[in-house]
């Protein structure tokens, strides 16, 4: 048995090695040799009792959503969509898979996490990694230069996810983007306003939005002595500062990425700073940084951004953080990331971030990558990390032991005596036709107690009870499940009464 387990482990390791070599675009001969080894290892495993051993589960990094989880998810989506619509966004959708070529070269070091689909004879396809690159492709393909849109859909990443922290291989993104040539920083400020509105509405706790600018980062790297070719890889090291210490980041930059220690120290002097508009002012006076054209542009824009954020009333939620260096290659200007704050144990301690819940930035060059003439369409946008938000909301509701309704049924059509199935069917149909959310139990002669119990469990507020006497009198007994109070309602007034009691508008508009 141990031998089989060892062999299974080797098959897994060899499979990972083959995938890694393919992603690194290793030589065809090396890939061929390693694939041959994988096949030999698999052959030694033999046919296996896999039929009996098959474990019924969802693939790694995925999950099912129960009705309870879906109810939470729909509430979260509702808050987000209402906000997007309030800001005048249209909605689009794009295919779940794109041509591999569309996604190539857009994600830098993260490209290794793209899911490639098996060749189906013809097109080389990959599952979308985010909603931004497909949006840029959509703009270029349709020659659009101006749109404000939102898009809510699943994306796919071959990550090693910590699912307990709301990280998955298949997950939803909720994106809002503004494309077009506008005056500086107005759309950027609106994106940050939207982010703050959504996070406040969701009531998931205190949050902070870190803001930086790609041009400031690039300018800073240049004056510190980082070669152009190392910019992106050093960015990805700096971006880890929210998770690990400066010492660890420095070790990675020097040890793994070949940066000179004195260059790393110069970077350290900058990236460990964070603050508000005063830090922007301070850096505008920095003798070295202010001499760099890119950095100067970035700082000028951030100063303007802070003015608008103050007017929007959200400047207290924003922190200028020089260590923010979001990993995606396509950002060109302002970048931002919202983190939830854990309440510190001791007063006077710095608030502690517990992971990104929203992020975004300006990407003015992405659409141009798809345009044959390289025509640029400036874009800025944000993405809400809903999976993490779902996890937080679910945990909060569990802690409060709050009951969540998983249906919206307003009334159960019940009967007090036998042989009234036909009458129940007629009444439930009348209610459906009038736009009432109604149910009945699928039994000919259900016990009244069972029907009332069903309402308790499902959280259905009303029961419309049919009895022989009621039929004769042309009334229906309407019972409130919580108060147990019953009233006779004339059949022709029932729809109006249910709507009145459940706060539903009287006409279906």
């Amino acid at each position: 048995m141990a031998e089989r387990a060892a062999l299974e482990e080797l098959v897994k390791l060899q499979g990972e090695r083959v995938r890694g070599l393919k992603q690194q675009k290793a030589s065809a001969e090396l890939i061929e040799e390693e694939v041959a080894k994988l096949l030999k290892l698999k052959a030694q495993l033999g046919p296996d009792e896999s039929k009996q051993k098959f474990v019924l589960k969802t693939p790694k990094g995925t999950r099912d959503y129960s009705p309870r989880q879906m109810a939470v998810r729909e509430k979260v989506f509702d808050v987000i969509i209402r906000c997007f619509k309030r800001h005048g966004a249209e909605v689009i959708d794009t295919p779940v898979f794109e041509l591999k070529e569309t996604l190539m070269g857009k994600y830098g070091e993260d490209s290794k996490l793209i899911y490639d689909l098996k060749d189906q004879g013809g097109e080389l396809l990959s599952l979308r990694y985010d909603l931004t690159v497909p949006f840029a492709r959509y703009l270029a393909m349709n020659k659009l230069t101006n749109i404000k849109r939102y898009h809510i859909a699943k994306v796919y990443r071959r990550d090693n996810p910590a699912m307990t922290r709301g990280r998955y291989r298949e997950f939803y993104q909720c994106d809002f983007d503004i494309a077009g040539n506008f005056d500086p920083m107005i759309p950027d400020a609106e994106c940050l306003k939207i982010m703050c509105e959504i996070l406040s509405s969701l009531q998931i706790g205190d949050f902070l939005v870190k803001v930086n600018d790609r041009r400031i980062l690039d300018g800073m790297f240049a004056i510190c002595g980082v070669s152009d070719s190392k910019f992106r890889t050093i960015c990805s090291s700096v971006d880890k500062l929210d998770k690990v210490s400066w010492e660890e980041v420095k070790n990675e930059m020097v040890g793994e990425k070949g940066l000179a220690p004195e260059v790393a120290d110069r970077i350290g002097d900058y990236v460990q700073q964070h603050g508000g508009v005063s830090l922007v002012e301070q850096l505008l006076q920095d003798p070295k940084l202010s001499q760099n054209k890119q950095a100067l542009e970035g700082l000028g824009d951030l100063k303007l951004l802070f003015e608008y954020l103050t007017l929007f009333g959200i400047d207290d939620k924003i922190s200028f953080d020089l260590s923010l260096a979001r990993g995606l290659d396509y950002y060109t200007g302002v970048i931002y990331e919202a983190v939830l704050l854990q309440t510190p144990a001791q007063a006077g301690e710095e608030p502690l971030g517990v992971g990104s819940v929203a992020a975004g930035g300006r990407y003015d060059g992405l659409v141009g990558m798809f345009d044959p003439k390289g025509r640029k369409v400036p874009c800025v946008g944000l993405s809400i990390g809903v999976e993490r938000i779902f996890s937080i909301v679910e945990q909060r509701l569990e802690a409060l032991e709050e009951k969540i309704r998983t249906t919206e049924t307003q009334v159960l059509v019940a009967s007090a005596q036998k042989k009234l199935l036909e009458e129940r069917l007629k009444l439930v149909s009348e209610l459906w036709d009038a736009g009432i959310k109604a149910e009945l139990l699928y039994k000919k002669n259900p016990k009244l107690l069972n029907q009332l119990q069903y309402c308790e469990e499902a959280g259905i507020p009303l029961v419309a009870i049919i009895g022989e006497q009621e039929l004769k009198d042309g009334v229906i007994k309407l019972r409130s499940v919580t108060s147990r109070e019953e009233v006779d309602v004339r059949r022709e007034d029932l729809v109006e009464e249910i709507k009145r009691r459940t706060g539903q508008p009287l006409c279906i508009c």
């Epitope: 060892a6 062999l7 482990e9 080797l10 390791l13 060899q14 990972e16 090695r17 040799e33 041959a36 080894k37 030999k40 290892l41 030694q44 793994e256």
Partner: antibody, heavy 120, light 107 residues
Framework: QVQLVESGGGLVKPGGSLRLSCAAS????????MTWIRQAPGKGLEWVSY????????NYADSVKGRFTISRDNAKNSLYLQMNSLRDEDTAVYFC?????????????WGQGTLVTVSS | DIQMTQSPSSVSASVGDRVTITCRAS??????LAWYQQKPGRAPKLLIF???SLQSGVPSRFSGSGSGTHFTLTISSLQPEDFATYYC?????????FGQGTKLEIK
């Protein structure tokens, strides 16, 4: 009995040649990648070269590339290492070994070793 | 090439002791690591492969752990026959390289 037995070692002058052999028994030789690993006196181990069961794949450490040639004869259950242009630094005990689970570059069965001394 | 660094280079211990030897790779090697035991004048003997899988016939007092760049070999209770030199080896990419060895001596 599952075993590997090396032969062919000896004293040779710098620039000279030598052919090492490794006789395998007790397992299906053609299924396995085979390798030569050496150990200089009092020193650590160095992976010299390997060959796949089907002869299709071979590789050499940079220190021996162009001078050593690995080969095998599956009919005779034998592995060979042809060593040309020998240098002082090639002095070592040469072990032949078999890959674990046929294709994993870890030696699960080793010969007793044969000493090659390169000296004028 | 991937460098393998073992520590300590030698260790003195007594029968019954628990001993741990560490091996570090200069870059990530997933779980492609083996441990060998070698006695003077003998060929190395495979103890552990794939970082933690015990080779058949090897006593269960030997165990391996780790992945990425940091690995350990542990002997839970030293026996007289365990005094030898121990080598780690990476099998991630060619040229496959060995650590410089750890000599385990009787205290």
């Amino acid at each position: 009995q599952v075993q590997l037995v090396e032969s062919g070692g000896g004293l040779v002058k710098p620039g000279g040649s030598l052919r090492l052999s490794c006789a395998a028994s007790g397992f299906t030789f053609s299924d396995y990648y085979m390798t030569w690993i050496r150990q200089a006196p009092g020193k650590g181990l160095e992976w010299v070269s390997y060959i796949s069961g089907s002869f299709r794949y071979t590789n050499y450490a940079d220190s021996v590339k162009g001078r050593f040639t690995i080969s095998r004869d599956n009919a005779k259950n034998s592995l060979y290492l042809q060593m040309n242009s020998l240098r002082d630094e090639d002095t070592a005990v040469y072990f032949c070994a078999r890959y674990v689970y046929q294709v994993v570059a870890i030696g699960d069965l080793w010969g007793q070793g044969t000493l090659v001394t390169v000296s004028s | 090439d991937i460098q393998m660094t073992q520590s300590p280079s030698s260790v003195s211990a007594s029968v019954g002791d628990r001993v741990t030897i560490t091996c570090r790779a200069s870059q990530g090697i997933s779980s492609w690591l083996a441990w060998y035991q070698q006695k003077p004048g003998r060929a190395p003997k495979l103890l552990i492969f794939a970082a933690s899988s015990l080779q058949s016939g090897v006593p269960s007092r030997f165990s391996g752990s780790g992945s990425g760049t940091h690995f350990t070999l542990t002997i839970s209770s030293l026996q007289p026959e365990d005094f030898a030199t121990y080598y780690c080896q990476q099998a991630e990419s060619f040229p496959y390289t060995f650590g410089q060895g750890t000599k385990l001596e009787i205290k």
